[in-house]
């Protein structure tokens, strides 16, 4: 789980191990703050929990452009 | 492809406690998400508890909250599902699920199964 | 946590009729944004583990006859046996994965009129 030591700066310590499928994800952001020890992904699911991820993991890159054509296509 | 192995049958007497194993081969355990799921003789099934990825950690059915503590070993690629304070009403057949390597929530791979017969 | 109701408790048709189970969720399990329905449906034979048949409430798992066929929205689900055949007669049941506590359904005994 994401780490808010010195809000509003949230950090990322661990990875989740787990590939979680793209239809359980709500959306997510980046971290890339230098007061962070790492570079991470947190996503956000459809019931609102959050979850640190890799960002050089393939399946978080594809996860991310999923979710970012999501956003972009206008629902029917 | 997974594959899931459980151990063999056992007879407990009231007040013990069981240890059911789920042995996984094609993937490794901390790659997936191990759950338990129980069935009474001819009742339904009954979600017990299991790991889930957004939690991050393991969480149980709240009717066997204190009861039941469920453990992986990943050098050994088991995971493990262990009872205590065993009642007559726990006899049923213990599985062990996991849903594929992406997480969704619904259970792909089942392991055959192992009875649990509770009697004094 | 979410309850899931089947009906009937049990059925009996008759070979090459259509078979109809019902699933009602206590609280929606659809997810607007991506219009996916976290439900799924499973068969059970005697002395078996359940078989996944269909996820996402109407995608058939690959392998499974197009004779079995879900649909639904929402907090109402149907599986469809399209012609009974005898290797059909099981006990299904329907699970939402929308939140924690997973659950199922109570099952629904399929057999042969």
């Known amino acids: 789980q994401p780490d808010a030591i010195n809000a509003p700066v949230t950090c990322c310590y661990n990875f989740t191990n787990r590939k979680i499928s793209v239809q359980r994800l709500a959306s997510y952001r980046r971290i890339t703050s230098s007061k962070c020890p790492k570079e991470a992904v947190i996503f956000k699911t459809i019931v609102a929990k959050e979850i640190c991820a890799d960002p050089k993991q393939k399946w978080v890159q594809d996860s991310m452009d999923h979710l970012d054509k999501q956003t972009q296509t206008p629902k029917t | 492809q997974v594959q899931l192995v459980q151990s063999g049958a056992e007879v407990k007497k009231p007040g013990a406690s069981v240890k059911v194993s789920c042995k996984v081969s094609g993937y490794t355990l901390t790659e997936l998400s191990m759950h338990w799921v129980r069935q009474a003789p001819g009742k339904g099934l009954e979600w017990m508890g299991g790991?889930?990825?957004?939690?991050?950690?393991?969480i149980y059915a709240q009717k066997f909250q204190g009861r039941v503590t469920m453990t992986e070993d990943t050098s050994t690629d088991t995971a493990y599902m262990e009872l205590s304070s065993l009642r007559s009403e726990d006899t049923a057949v213990y599985y062990c699920?996991?849903?594929?390597?992406?997480?969704?929530?619904?259970?792909?791979?089942w392991g055959q199964g192992t009875l649990v017969t509770v009697s004094s | 946590d979410i309850v899931m109701t089947q009906s009937p408790d049990s059925l009996a048709v008759s070979l090459g009729e259509r078979a109809t189970i019902n699933c009602k969720s206590s609280q929606s399990v659809l997810y607007s944004s991506n219009n996916e329905n976290f439900l799924a449906w499973y068969q059970q034979k005697p002395g078996q583990p359940p078989k996944l048949l269909i996820y996402w409430a109407s995608t058939r798992e690959s392998g499974v006859p197009d004779r079995f066929s879900g649909s639904g929205s929402g907090t109402d689900f149907t599986l469809t046996i399209s012609s009974l055949q005898a290797e059909d007669v099981a006990v299904y049941y329907c699970q939402q994965y929308y939140n924690s506590p997973w659950t199922f359904g109570q099952g629904t005994k399929v057999e042969i009129k």
């Open positions: 790991f889930d990825p957004e939690d991050g950690e393991t």
């Open positions: 699920a996991t849903d594929r390597e992406f997480w969704s929530g619904y259970f792909y791979h």
